[in-house]
């Protein structure tokens, strides 16, 4: 669909005569009839197959025709066509004299013709005007013409219909050849497919508008390139959705079981060496001079009362030193220079001669000890604390610091591990010598019956087209990760390609 446009510019009829040579009275009131038709090697009369148009009276004898396209569209003359422009044409322009106001052909005498020109040739669609001038014996006509496409028609012969649009059936403008030119952010044959955010994962992300990245199930992140780990995964990662691959030092279904308490919590103090001995369990090996479960207690080397015979102990950086009372000597004041005659036994102790009086021994009353009965009895020396408990002197009494799992005055009682009801989901607890054991009801497993025994939803191979199946253990359902080109919850549907362009 297009328009053949003819712009009349100047008509010269200086003598004001008709084609017959007869003069017009009082002058030649001139109007034009235009016939556009298919190409003819010799232009002959007949139907104006491409259209006709007539003008009103434009002037008398000789005149210039002004451009009147803005005021009614009479010049240039418009000859619309609703077919593919063939590229060739024939054009007949007749100048007529109008004696009266009726310009219909049947109302005019045949000899009212002033002049007739006929041209034919090739004409390509385009914006440029072709200027032409035709001269006869008595007249001259100057004009120009062109063919342009109607609105929304494009191409070399105005045959391609294209309407720009910006809705969900297309986001494009039309190129001069009628092809679509997608608006920024859109692609596809009809420009209805948005271009997702740059870097948006091809399989795991999609978009409904440009520069967007919406994630398919099991994926997250700005570019949908990060898998979502199993729900509840604490210290683990994934490489595909719903996985929970534990970080070093962690175990269990949710990677929430601490297998490296030493590294994660550094419980041992004062430079002690830590050894992992199970889940949340460890042992500290203390450096000399320290004690306690976590080696948190500083040992005084005088605490073991190494000085005998009433010697007083002094702590030193590299050990200890005994200050011996009169009559004693040696590293621990263990050597005596006394005899029973010197009354060496304190606190009512009785003295017995030895080695013909060269030595002696004190027999101490209850609650006293030492070679001279100089020390009150250390209540911890008899190791009264059971099960590895640590005995601590507290003035006249003593107390036992028990190891985990034991209680009682002398750590003689085993704490029931079952008292805390550690078995989840109705599991039955059994005390063992070194801990406890849970007997789990049907449908649960794990050391504490904390793991729901899930049905493997992927066992039935529900995913099609070589998709990867993941079991969502929290819901006993499956998720299919589709290969490129397939969609649907089971990846059963191929993504259809748009049909070919109808032109």
């Amino acid at each position: 669909s297009g328009v053949f446009q003819l712009q009349l510019q100047e008509f010269i009829n200086e003598r004001g005569v008709l084609a017959s040579g007869r003069p017009c009275e009082p002058g030649c009131r001139t109007f034009f009839r235009v016939c556009l038709k298919h190409f003819q090697a010799v232009v002959s009369p007949g139907p104006c197959t491409f259209g006709t148009v007539s003008t009103p009276v434009l002037g008398t004898n000789s005149f210039a025709v002004r451009d009147d396209s803005s005021g009614g569209g009479r010049n240039p003359l418009q000859l619309p066509f609703n077919f593919t422009w063939p590229g060739t044409f024939s054009l007949i322009i007749e100048a007529w004299h109008a004696p009266g106001d009726d310009l219909r052909p049947e109302a005019l005498p045949p000899d009212a013709l002033i002049s007739k020109i006929a041209i034919q040739g090739s004409l390509a669609v385009g914006q440029n005007w072709l200027l032409d001038e035709q001269t006869s014996t008595l007249t001259r006509l100057r004009y120009s013409y062109r063919v342009i496409c109607s609105d929304n028609y494009y191409g070399d012969n105005c045959s391609r219909l294209c309407k720009k649009r910006n809705d969900h059936f297309g986001h494009y403008v039309c190129q001069p050849d009628g092809n679509l030119s997608c608006l920024p952010g859109w692609t596809g044959e009809y420009c209805q497919q948005p271009i997702c955010l740059s870097g948006c994962h091809e399989q795991n992300g999609y978009c409904s508008k440009p520069a967007e990245c919406l994630c398919r199930p099991g994926w997250q992140g700005r570019l949908c390139n990060e898998c979502i780990p199993h729900n509840g995964c604490r210290h683990g990662t994934c490489s595909t959705p719903w996985q929970c691959t534990c970080d070093e030092g962690w175990g269990g279904l949710f990677c929430d079981q601490d297998l490296n308490y030493c590294t994660h919590h550094s419980p041992c103090k004062n430079g002690a060496t830590c050894s992992n001995s199970g889940q949340r369990s460890y042992t500290c090996t203390c450096r000399p001079g320290y004690t306690g479960v976590d080696c948190e207690l500083e040992l005084s080397e005088c605490d073991s009362n190494p000085c005998r015979n009433g010697g007083s102990c002094k702590d030193q950086e590299d050990g200890y030193h005994c200050l011996c009372p009169p009559g004693y000597y040696g590293l621990h004041c263990e050597h005596s220079t006394l005899s029973c005659a010197d009354s060496p036994c304190f606190n009512g102790g009785s003295c017995r001669e030895r080695n013909q009086g060269a030595n002696y021994a004190c027999e101490c009353p209850p609650n006293f000890t030492g070679s001279n009965c100089e020390k009150k009895v250390d209540r911890c020396t008899s190791n009264p604390c059971a099960n590895g408990g640590q005995c601590l002197n507290r003035g006249p009494s003593r107390m036992c610091r028990c190891r985990p799992g034991f209680t009682g005055t002398y750590c003689e009682l085993h704490v029931s591990d079952c008292a805390r009801n550690p078995c989840a989901h109705g599991g039955t607890c059994h005390d063992l010598e070194n801990g406890l054991m849970c007997t789990c009801p049907a449908g649960f497993s794990g050391r504490r019956c904390e793991v729901r025994t899930s049905i493997d939803a992927c066992a039935s191979s529900p995913c099609f087209n070589r998709a990867t199946c993941y079991t969502d253990l929290s819901t006993d359902t499956f998720v299919c990760n589709c290969p490129y080109g397939f969609v649907g919850s089971r990846c059963e549907f191929p993504v259809g390609l748009p049909p070919s362009f109808p032109w």
Partner: antibody, heavy 121, light 106 residues
Framework: EVQLQESGPGLVKPSETLSLTCTVS??????????WGWIRQPPGKGLEWIGD???????YYNPSLKSRVTISVDTSKNQFSLKLSSVTAADTAVYYC?????????????WGQGTLVTVSS | SYELTQPPSVSVSPGQTASITCSGQ??????ASWYQQKPGQSPVLVIY???KRPSGIPERFSGSNSGDTATLTISGTQPMDEADYYC?????????FGYGTKVTVL
């Protein structure tokens, strides 16, 4: 050949929600060339476009119904659905599901047979 | 909101030409579709993108669209063409149907 089939209750009480499902057979709802829509026709009156949806879930609604309409798609079942809330007698109509084709400039060459929904107490 | 206006009815004798108009602001800049609907049946697409015929639609159905008016022409109308005809276009992202024209074959 693609066929569409509407299903849902034929009678809905005023102020309740109208729910219809359209099942697509003979082709995939996940094609990039189509939008899937709903059109209604009150008895003795003309056609009214309600809205449509793309397989990714993008929706487009008639502004006059937008506050009451929800269209959703289930690619695994090859279905799409219409929900129209707070219905009145004026919502009584034959409801059609249809496929709008990008390559036809948005024209619809495939329609369901339609289902009459009456709103009455 | 965008509106498409159609004449309520058009009468035509068998074998004659029926023309149905559809008017809307700058409709010529949009693609027009035409649907035929017979009583108790679903609509059928007869013209899309102004003037294109889907396969199976007889050649007597033609369409044009320019300015503010789209026209559906049925040449050599047959009694089986008696039906309601609806024009349809998209205004941005909203689908719009005309009010419909009843074509009666006398």
């Amino acid at each position: 050949e693609v066929q569409l089939q509407e299903s849902g209750p034929g009678l809905v009480k005023p102020s309740e929600t109208l729910s219809l499902t359209c099942t697509v057979s003979g082709g995939s709802i996940s094609s990039s060339s189509y939008y899937w829509g709903w059109i209604r026709q009150p008895p003795g009156k003309g056609l009214e476009w309600i809205g449509d949806i793309y397989y990714t879930g993008s929706t487009y609604y008639n502004p006059s119904l937008k506050s009451r309409v929800t269209i959703s798609v289930d690619t695994s079942k090859n279905q799409f659905s219409l929900k129209l809330s707070s219905v009145t007698a004026a919502d009584t109509a034959v409801y059609y599901c249809a496929r709008f084709d990008v390559s036809l400039g948005g024209g619809s060459d495939t329609w369901g047979q339609g289902t009459l929904v009456t709103v009455s107490s | 909101s965008y509106e498409l206006t159609q004449p309520p009815s058009v009468s035509v004798s068998p074998g004659q030409t029926a023309s149905i108009t559809c008017s809307g602001q700058r409709l010529g800049d949009k693609y027009a579709s035409w649907y035929q609907q017979k009583p108790g049946q679903s609509p059928v697409l007869v013209i899309y993108e102004d003037s294109k015929r889907p396969s199976g639609i007889p050649e007597r159905f033609s369409g044009s669209n320019s300015g503010d008016t789209a026209t559906l022409t049925i040449s050599g109308t047959q009694p089986m063409d008696e039906a309601d005809y609806y024009c349809q276009a998209w205004d941005r992202d909203t689908g719009v149907f005309g009010y419909g024209t009843k074509v009666t074959v006398l």
